[in-house]
Structures are given as structure tokens and as C-alpha cells.
């Protein structure tokens, strides 16, 4: 999902030496940055989250807050510290004039400051309900395990916790952090205030229409009676959950965030911290018919972001808008006319639509999976959600053309059995943000901390790219794609897999002098080839065509253009075996695919040859897709011939371990 260099507005206020010495310059002369919501109507100027550097202690946070107040007072400004953060992120929430930002950015320990902004419930029309008869009953659904070992936290509106659908299933915490309702004539009608949260609690764990009927829930009120909240209120709610987890550790935790605001660095950072503490976060992609990467928490890579589809598996249209899409969406789930508890009466039901409802479905499925396998990590859970999803059922024509390739064609489903998937080698495809069009622009795709990067490919709509390479960054391999002169930009595509006890390395061969092309293989004992990448410095590789098929007996070999450097991803893991599968088409074709057969998982996807008419290669589920320029522009020369190269792997070790458990 979203990289650190995400699409949000960043204002860097330079530190000036004219400051009257009251503030220490930040360490190492680094410049603290200021961020605010890119969507102007959602901004809340006057309230700021001051985020301090990671190692900052609570006492230092309090001291920094006091220092800001003292310095502001000397300048004749009143400030109010609304909250001091600790446990999740170090920092504080302050009410102050925007005039003090430059001063605040110079304080010691300050990493960045973010102006507060609004977040919104993601259901339409959540407060204009269509009531269905109280006698309504969803078709009986009896799951094998109701998620009884899992606790689901819901950050939403207030809820009617004694509704028959959810009575005894939801504990309303005393947490409440909501803004005042807009408008002087707003009338707080309890049933409307509770509408969104009650419905979602019912979708997650309702006795009749719930997904995980055995899951217990805890609700935190972060949205007001109009379904509106703030980034700061959500942050404090997430901190509350972390503190509760530390005070009383329970079983697996799922946090449902059925809300969205503009891109927020601080909200994404808090989600990352909570996820790394072992909490599964599920969020709504947003109802703006837009790129989910422009919203938070949808854009946080550690969060499971859910788009909405209807009963026909089509993306949900909501008035003039609809579900968000793009690379920051992990999967889709039912989100149109979803029946659930209505706060209008204790036995009423209502249908609501939106990505909130879709996220609630996935939170329920996650609770079921975690109840069956409580030791699952976030990475394992995400991979299972993807693996068990219905594939390629969404009509992609609904999405903007440039987003189709980036948007996962996956609709969430419960696994056929809650046990027994352990033997599978799970992989997923992670797209980077777009590099931008400059000559030296690059794009980076990253895997989650406990996933292995098994291959790296790249894609450019213009075809002007300089390939890709795997490189170490902060002790982990990342996938970097390179734009070319005149190119409109590139994407890096990482294939991220769960491979316990893996030892992976990258072997590189520089461009070959000979006309035979460049080759590289896995020479270490017990290492197998999981992916091939190629990267070149020249602007156009020309038409040189290397021999596509590998010599017999050398499956652990990558081949490529003689002017390109070739990178082989070589891994050693217990019982790991891989094979190369190729599909070549002599005539020019816009798309060439090759799939791994049942029982094998696609780990690597690349194209031969790497000439400039190839737009790139990427994995879609278990299929390697190679895209070329429009046939009409390519002509039917031999240059048009393209081969899709898939590397398919399986783990006999995982299969054996699974059999031993059964």
C-alpha cells in the first residue's frame, strides 16, 4: 500500500537561525515537517498532532509540550495541551494558533506535525435507513466456529448494545472522543446516533445476520451523531486499545476502522505501530470512487483495506460516487444492501451500503480465521484472506483504466475449512506507488516485515522503463523499478511470500559482452531460483533477442538481454522446490500469460526479451502476465514475439508439517 512518500500535502518549514534561542535546534540539524489534509473542507486548523521521534519518553513529551506552551506565552499566544500520546506514538495534541507552527517545528524531539482533520463513517445512507420488517431473518448461516476466541474492537458511533442481534456480544467501553455536531439546529436522536455502529456490530457478530457469531466486541465512540470524527480522536482511540492490550493481554485482537479521512501520515503511523504489536486492523477503503491511497487509514500498508462489491460481484456505486479502488485495496467484500441490526428498535433490521459494511465482513472473516488458528500473524492472515477470495469475478471496466491493473480482483470469502491451509505456499502481489515521469525516477515496492520478497518486476504504460532490481534496504530486500527518459513513470511489483526459515539472496550478472545475452544462476548448494529481474542503463535495449529456452538441466538460471544486468532471487528453505514455466507466442500479442498448475504457487514473473515494446510483467494470483505495446503499433516483426516466464514453487516441508498436525 502507500509508501512513505505518499500523496499528501507536505509543507516543510525551514528552520531559521533568527529564533531567539528559546528552542533547541532539532538533533543532527534535521528539519521537522508539517503535514495537512489535502482535502481542504476536511481540515481542522487550530488543532495539531505534534509527533516526536520514536525513542522519545513520556517525560520528554510532557517537557516538550510545556516548553511549547511557555514559548507561545512569551509571544502572547494561548495554547492548550489536549492530550499527551504514549504507548503507540510519542507526541501530544495541542490547540494553538497556526502562527506557532514554525516555533513548534524547532522544538527538540519533534519529528513532524500534522494538522488535525476529519474522518467519516463509510456507509450510505447510514442515517436515512430503509427499515426492513422486524421479522426479517437472513438465511440461516451456521459457521463451523463463530470466532469465539477473538475480540473485535469497533471504532465508530455509539451503539445500541442491547439490540437483540448483539445483546451480550458487545461491551461498550467508556472511551469517547468525538467532535461537536455541525449546525445549530442539529437534534441528537439516539437511534440515529447509534445507527452506523449498531449495524456494523451486527454485521460482524450479530446472532442472525453476523459473520462471526461467536466473536465478542468492544466499542469505542470516535464518530459523532453525524458519523463524523477526527484523526486525533481516532489516534487516541487506537492508543486506548494498545494500553488495554498491555494491561490485560487477551487472545487475538481485530480492530475495525469503518471510517476514512484524507491521507494522514500520523494515522497511518499509529496503525503501523498497532499492527506491529500483533493487532489485526481492518478498514474501509472509502466511498469516494477514488484511489484508496489518497485516504487514511485505507492507505496504511499494515492495515487490511476493503473495497465494496454487490451481490453480482460488481463494484458498489453509491449515489454519484462508489467504492474506492487501487493498489491500496487488499480485497473487496459485500457492501451493498447489507442487512444488519437497526437502532430504530431492539428487533429491527435495516440494509446499509458502503465500504464500512465490506470491512465489517472481512473483520468477521478474520475473527473466524483467528479463532481457528490463534497464532496466525497479520501477514499470514492477509495471505489467507487473499488466497481464499473469489478470483477474477469483478468487472474491472467500472474502475478507471489506469487503476484496473493495480486493483485486486478479489472478493473475500470464508475458507472452506477453517483448518488445513498450513501446507500452502502463500504469495501476494504488491504494487508500488507510481514513480513519476522524471528521467531518474524510481518506484519501490516492499513486502511486510515477515514476508519474503521472492521476485521483482516492473511495468510502464508507455513501455519506457529501465527494468527493475532487488536491493537491500534497512536489512530487507525491496523491489525498485527505474523509469526511462521520455517515460511517463513506472511501477515496481513485488511478489511477497510466506516462507518460514527462508534464506534468500540476490545474484547479479552485469551486462554481457558477448551476443549470447546475460545469464545468472543460483550456484549455492540447496538454493532454488524464485524470481528473475533485469535492469539496464541504456534508454532502449533494441531488438536483440536472447535464447528464450534455458539449456536442459539448468532450471536455476535467469537469462536476459546482453545490455542488461540480470538479477536472480535465490532462496533456501526447508523442502522448497521450484520450476520454470514459459509460454511464448511468435506473433505479436498485447498480453501473454502463463499460470502455475494446482499445488504450485507463482513466485516469479518476468518477460523475455526485455526489449522496449514490452510494457512489463506482473503476477495476478497464480498467473504471470506480460503486457506489450499495442499490436497495431508494434507491427508483426519478430520483435513482437514475447515469452512470459513464470517460476512456480511449492514447499514439501509445509505440506509435511500440515500432515503431521492432522
Amino acid at each position: 500500500q502507500e509508501d512513505e512518500d505518499g500523496d499528501y500535502e507536505e509543507l516543510v518549514l525551514a528552520l531559521r537561525s533568527e529564533e531567539d534561542g528559546l528552542a533547541e535546534a532539532p538533533e543532527h540539524g534535521t528539519t521537522a515537517t508539517f503535514h495537512r489534509c489535502a482535502k481542504d473542507p476536511w481540515r481542522l486548523p487550530g488543532t495539531y498532532v505534534v509527533v516526536l521521534k520514536e525513542e522519545t519518553h513520556l517525560s520528554q513529551s510532557e517537557r516538550t509540550a510545556r516548553r511549547l506552551q511557555a514559548q507561545a506565552a512569551r509571544r502572547g499566544y494561548l495554547t492548550k495541551i489536549l492530550h499527551v500520546f504514549h504507548g503507540l506514538l510519542p507526541g501530544f495534541l495541542v490547540k494553538m494558533s497556526g502562527d506557532l507552527l514554525e516555533l513548534a517545528l524547532k522544538l527538540p524531539h519533534v519529528d513532524y506535525i500534522e494538522e488535525d482533520s476529519s474522518v467519516f463513517a463509510q456507509s450510505i445512507p447510514w442515517n436515512l435507513e430503509r427499515i426492513t420488517p422486524p421479522r426479517y431473518r437472513a438465511d440461516e448461516y451456521q459457521p463451523p466456529d463463530g470466532g469465539s476466541l477473538v475480540e473485535v474492537y469497533l471504532l465508530d458511533t455509539s451503539i445500541q448494545s442491547d439490540h437483540r442481534e448483539i445483546e451480550g456480544r458487545v461491551m461498550v467501553t467508556d472511551f469517547e472522543n468525538v467532535p461537536e455536531e455541525d449546525g445549530t439546529r442539529f437534534h441528537r436522536q439516539a437511534s440515529k446516533c447509534d445507527s452506523h455502529g449498531t449495524h456494523l456490530a451486527g454485521v460482524v457478530s450479530g446472532r442472525d445476520a453476523g459473520v462471526a457469531k461467536g466473536a465478542s466486541m468492544r466499542s469505542l465512540r470516535v464518530l459523532n451523531c453525524q458519523g463524523k470524527g477526527t484523526v486525533s480522536g481516532t489516534l487516541i482511540g487506537l492508543e486506548f486499545i494498545r494500553k488495554s492490550q498491555l494491561v490485560q493481554p487477551v487472545g487475538p485482537l481485530v480492530v475495525l476502522l469503518p471510517l476514512a479521512g484524507g491521507y494522514s501520515r500520523v494515522l497511518n503511523a499509529a496503525c503501523q505501530r498497532l499492527a506491529r504489536a500483533g493487532v489485526v486492523l481492518v478498514t474501509a477503503a472509502g466511498n469516494f470512487r477514488d484511489d484508496a491511497c489518497l485516504y487514511s487509514p485505507a492507505s496504511a500498508p499494515e492495515v487490511i483495506t476493503v473495497g465494496a462489491t454487490n451481490a453480482q460481484d460488481q463494484p458498489v456505486t453509491l449515489g454519484t460516487l462508489g467504492t474506492n479502488f487501487g493498489r491500496c485495496v487488499d480485497l473487496f467484500a459485500p457492501g451493498e444492501d447489507i442487512i444488519g441490526a437497526s437502532s430504530d428498535c431492539s428487533t429491527c433490521f435495516v440494509s446499509q451500503s458502503g465500504t464500512s459494511q465490506a470491512a465489517a465482513h472481512v473483520a468477521g472473516i478474520a475473527a473466524m480465521m483467528l479463532s481457528a488458528e490463534p497464532e496466525l500473524t497479520l501477514a499470514e492472515l492477509r495471505q489467507r484472506l487473499i488466497h481464499f477470495s473469489a478470483k477474477d469475478v469483478i468487472n474491472e471496466a467500472w474502475f478507471p483504466e489506469d487503476q484496473r491493473v493495480l486493483t485486486p480482483n478479489l472478493v473475500a470469502a470464508l475458507p472452506p475449512s477453517t483448518h488445513g491451509a498450513g501446507w500452502q505456499l502463500f504469495c501476494r502481489t504488491v504494487w508500488s506507488a507510481h514513480s513519476g515521469p522524471t528521467r531518474m525516477a524510481t518506484a519501490v515496492a516492499r513486502c511486510a516485515p515477515d514476508e519474503e520478497l521472492l521476485s521483482c518486476s516492473s511495468f510502464s504504460r508507455s513501455g519506457k522503463r529501465r527494468g527493475e532490481r532487488m536491493e537491500a534496504q534497512g536489512g530487507k530486500l525491496v523491489c525498485r523499478a527505474h523509469n526511462a527518459f521520455g517515460g511517463e513513470g513506472v511501477y515496481a511489483i513485488a511478489r511477497c511470500c510466506l516462507l518460514p526459515q527462508a534464506n534468500c539472496s540476490v545474484h547479479t550478472a552485469p551486462p554481457a559482452e558477448a551476443s549470447m545475452g546475460t545469464r545468472v544462476h543460483c550456484h549455492q548448494q540447496g538454493h532454488v531460483l524464485t524470481g528473475c529481474s533485469s535492469h539496464w542503463e541504456v534508454e532502449d535495449l533494441g531488438t536483440h533477442k536472447p535464447p528464450v529456452l534455458r539449456p536442459r538441466g539448468q532450471p536455476n538460471q535467469c537469462v536476459g538481454h546482453r545490455e542488461a544486468s540480470i538479477h536472480a532471487s535465490c532462496c533456501h528453505a526447508p523442502g522448497l522446490e521450484c520450476k520454470v514455466k514459459e509460454h511464448g507466442i511468435p506473433a505479436p500479442q498485447e498480453q501473454v500469460t502463463v499460470a502455475c498448475e494446482e499445488g504450485w504457487t507463482l513466485t516469479g514473473c518476468s518477460a523475455l526479451p526485455g526489449t522496449s515494446h514490452v510494457l512489463g510483467a506482473y503476477a495476478v494470483d497464480n498467473t504471470c502476465v506480460v503486457r506489450s505495446r499495442d499490436v497495431s503499433t508494434t507491427g508483426s516483426t519478430s520483435e513482437g514475439a514475447v515469452t512470459a516466464v513464470a517460476i512456480c514453487c511449492r514447499s514439501r516441508h509445509l505440506a509435511q508439517a500440515s500432515q503431521e498436525l492432522q
Epitope: R135, Q160, S161, G168
Partner: antibody, heavy 115, light 107 residues
Framework: QVQLVQSGAEVKKPGASVKVSCKAS????????ISWVRQAPGQGLEWMGW????????NYAQKLQGRGTMTTDPSTSTAYMELRSLRSDDTAVYYC????????WGQGTTVTVSS | DIQMTQSPSSLSASVGDRVTITCRAS??????LDWYQQKPGKAPKLLIY???TLESGVPSRFSGSGSGTDFTLTISSLQPEDFATYYC?????????FGQGTKVEIK
């Protein structure tokens, strides 16, 4: 521990009213409503209705509508059931029970209607 | 309203006997059926909910089965403390309705 404690026995004349109380403790009262169930001497159980501690909403059985009123005092976690225009066939033991699931019951309050 | 009919209305059995009580609903209640035990002068006590799930603290000799319209409560080996009246109750629709009860007496 989770318990529902009801008020003591009542003897009423026909036409009078009775108000039975039920104090809940040992759990988060707003997570459940209170159901009222009555049992005439030697007879079976009859559900009278449900009441919310959270917002005071009620759900009455058809038979009770008009004559019965269920209320709460959230500050003391107490639920009340008032029955007006009492008749001799209202003589019964009145029970409060937790929620719609009826998983915890009060000890019962005997109401005798006799002239 | 959904009518609940229990049979038999009473039965005599000895300690150690296997006892079966049936309950029929006038329309499907899916698996939303609960069983209660009531002793003289006491409040009913929940034994089984959701047709077959034993309430915590209830001895395993009690079991429930069935779905739709036909349900059964079984006591595998009757104990002295089990002599009481048993009620079924549907929890599928409002109003909640009870069976007329089955009295289990000592033979």
C-alpha cells in the same frame, strides 16, 4: 456475580395497579435489556415484553399493550414493570430475566389479585 | 405467534433412566430453541440454548438436538435432582413463546 433481585410479594384489589422492581448487578447492564415473564399458578410461562436499560425502549407482547408499562432507572440499574387495571387472572409470579436470551432470572415476585 | 407444543406433558421415570422430551414449533424456528428447568417455588434455569449448546455449569447428561420445527431434550441418566418441570422456548421470533411444560416425576 450476575444477579437480578426483585421486590417482594404484593396483594392487590381488582382495578388497582402494581409496580414490580428488578435490580440488576454483576454485569454491564446496558449490554442487555430486561424481559418480563409471568407464570400463573400451575400454569406455563408467558413472555410479557422487553425493556432497554440503554435507551428505555420497550417491546411489549400484544396481550399486555395498554395495561402494562416498563421503565428503568439507569442510575440504580433497576427495571420496573407496572400493571394497571388488575384482574384476578393477573395473579401470577412475575419474573424479570436478562435480555432476550433469558439466561439469568430474578427470584420472582408473587402478585395476588383478590377482592 | 409461534405455538410451541411439548410432549409428553408429564412422565414418570427412575434414577438412571434415559429421558427424552420433545418440542414441536408451529413453524420453523431454525435452531433458535432453548430449554429450561424449573423446580417448585423457583425461577426457571437455562439448560440449553441454540437447540444444542449446553449453558455453562449444566451437567453433560443434558443434551439437545433438532432444528426447524422438531426438537428433543435428552437426559442420559436421570439423577434425583433432575425431577422438575422442563420448558422449551423459541427465540426465533417476537413474542418469545414457551411450551406448556413437561413434568418429570419419580416413578
Amino acid at each position: 456475580q450476575v444477579q437480578l433481585v426483585q421486590s417482594g410479594a404484593e396483594v392487590k384489589k381488582p382495578g388497582a395497579s402494581v409496580k414490580v422492581s428488578c435490580k440488576a448487578s454483576g454485569y454491564t447492564v446496558t449490554s442487555y435489556g430486561i424481559s418480563w415473564v409471568r407464570q400463573a399458578p400451575g400454569q406455563g410461562l408467558e413472555w410479557m415484553g422487553w425493556l432497554s436499560f440503554y435507551n428505555g425502549n420497550t417491546n411489549y407482547a400484544q396481550k399486555l399493550q395498554g395495561r402494562g408499562t416498563m421503565t428503568t432507572d439507569p442510575s440504580t440499574s433497576t427495571a420496573y414493570m407496572e400493571l394497571r387495571s388488575l384482574r384476578s387472572d393477573d395473579t401470577a409470579v412475575y419474573y424479570c430475566a436478562r435480555g432476550y436470551s433469558l439466561d439469568v432470572w430474578g427470584q420472582g415476585t408473587t402478585v395476588t389479585v383478590s377482592s | 405467534d409461534i405455538q410451541m407444543t411439548q410432549s409428553p406433558s408429564s412422565l414418570s421415570a427412575s434414577v438412571g433412566d434415559r429421558v427424552t422430551i420433545t418440542c414441536r414449533a408451529s413453524q420453523s424456528v431454525r435452531n433458535w430453541l432453548d430449554w429450561y428447568q424449573q423446580k417448585p417455588g423457583k425461577a426457571p434455569k437455562l439448560l440449553i440454548y441454540g437447540a444444542s449448546t449446553l449453558e455453562s455449569g449444566v451437567p453433560s447428561r443434558f443434551s439437545g438436538s433438532g432444528s426447524g420445527t422438531d426438537f428433543t431434550l435428552t437426559i442420559s441418566s436421570l439423577q434425583p435432582e433432575d425431577f422438575a418441570t422442563y420448558y422449551c422456548q423459541q427465540d426465533n421470533d417476537i413474542p418469545l413463546t414457551f411450551g406448556q411444560g413437561t413434568k418429570v416425576e419419580i416413578k
